[in-house]
Amino acid sequence: QLPPGKPEIFKCRSPNKETFTCWWRPGTDGGLPTNYSLTYHREGETLMHECPDYITGGPNSCHFGKQYTSMWRTYVMMVNATNQMGSSFSDELYVDVTYIVQPDPPLELTVEVKQPEDRKPYLWMKWSPPTLIDLKTGWFTLLYEIRLKPEKAAEWETHFAGQQTEFKILSLHPGQKYLVQVRCKPDHGYWSAWSPATFIQIPSDFIMNDHHHHHH
């Protein structure tokens, strides 16, 4: 029987910069029941606080609700593992909420086949940013990525859309049913999950184009 091994805080995420959650990985348990506690202070403070919510994020997590989350202060945190034989501490971790945002997927993805008389046909798609993200503040820039594939294909084709919320694709296989998805990330945050798939049937008379795609 031994003291617990060193835990590691390995992940912190915020859906919208207003709340965030951090998760740790326990070290070895030393063969005894082990208790974990997360303590933190914010930059400019010396007073240590204990994790306000060990429940919301699931096992080995600490959730910081709205009243505990500040975008303007770096959090300095550490996990303590304790059993009957002793204690061990994780390395200190520094968290700036700006850099851990993982938004919800974009919303309202719509996909249409456009067949203008004077130009080659193309696939046109548009979407909306996730509702929890406040883009009006200016500092929150979302980047988007699209992926699509014929229904029975194994490989996805991906396109980076930058900050646009609409996109054209010119090269598709006629007569195929395509799945289309979109995801987003802040410039220094993390990719969202992919949006639910939208299906689109490409007409059999859709003319393939040599130019692959272009931004709207």
Partner: antibody, heavy 118, light 112 residues
């Protein structure tokens, strides 16, 4: 203990490429961004670019865009910085550095001297 | 790119005496999220840089309290209240508000 261990010194000809490695240990590699910074002899520091090892998303200094490629190998917890079309002005010590969930550099590799000379 | 200008270029200090280094940026370092990402690094002779101060005034873990940072907007200062022999090296200010991140040219601190 967090460690970033870089590959050894290189001597390269003008016009060639160099690939410097940075092996990380002591933490979960995919958790934190890795940055590359260089320092020419007797000079200041210059940021080259950064990579998020979780998804290989990169940002580059426009000055190096087109000549630099930053990659990772998650299976070996190693980041790489490849610089092409080398010229004598690229002679420098190249550092990898790691952030936390922040945008400043808490841990640095020991540096790799790249000498470009004909 | 944001230009970071440090003064003085070098500084010779008697042990136990204070030292001050100035850093000026060519544009405001206040991020649109309200934070100011101005940091100070020390590069001791023959070593890699090490973080001293993050976000203007916050000492990194293990940094002695004789180091302090202050400033706002475009003007920033690093102070060492009582210089010790182990403080010799080149001090760099750095900004990570704007991409590309940039560094000052460095201030070399020597002991008299």
């Amino acid at each position: 203990e967090v460690q970033l261990v870089q590959s050894g010194a290189e001597v390269k000809k003008p016009g060639s490429s160099v690939k410097v490695s940075c092996k990380a240990s002591g933490y979960t590699f995919t958790s934190y961004w890795i940055h590359w910074v260089r320092q020419a002899p007797g000079q200041g520091l210059e940021w080259i670019g950064e990579i998020d090892p979780s998804d290989s998303y990169t940002n580059y200094n426009q000055k190096f865009k087109g000549r630099v490629t930053i990659t990772v190998d998650k299976s070996t917890s190693t980041a790489y910085m490849e610089l092409s079309s080398l010229r004598s002005e690229d002679t420098a010590v190249y550092y990898c550095a790691r952030s936390f969930f922040t945008n400043w550099f808490a841990y640095w590799g020991q540096g790799t001297l790249v000498t470009v000379s004909s | 790119d944001v230009v970071m200008t440090q003064t003085p270029l070098s500084l010779s200090v008697t042990p136990g005496q204070p030292a001050s280094i100035s850093c000026r940026s060519s544009q405001s370092l206040v991020h649109s999220n309200g934070n100011t990402y101005l940091h100070w690094y020390l590069q001791k002779p023959g070593q890699s840089p090490q973080l001293l101060i993050y976000k203007v005034s916050n000492r990194f873990s293990g940094v002695p309290d004789r180091f302090s940072g202050s400033g706002s907007g475009t003007d920033f200062t690093l102070k060492i209240s009582r210089v010790e022999a182990e403080d010799v090296g080149v001090y760099f200010c750095s900004q990570s508000t704007h991409v590309p991140f940039t560094f000052g040219g460095g201030t070399k601190v020597e002991i008299k």
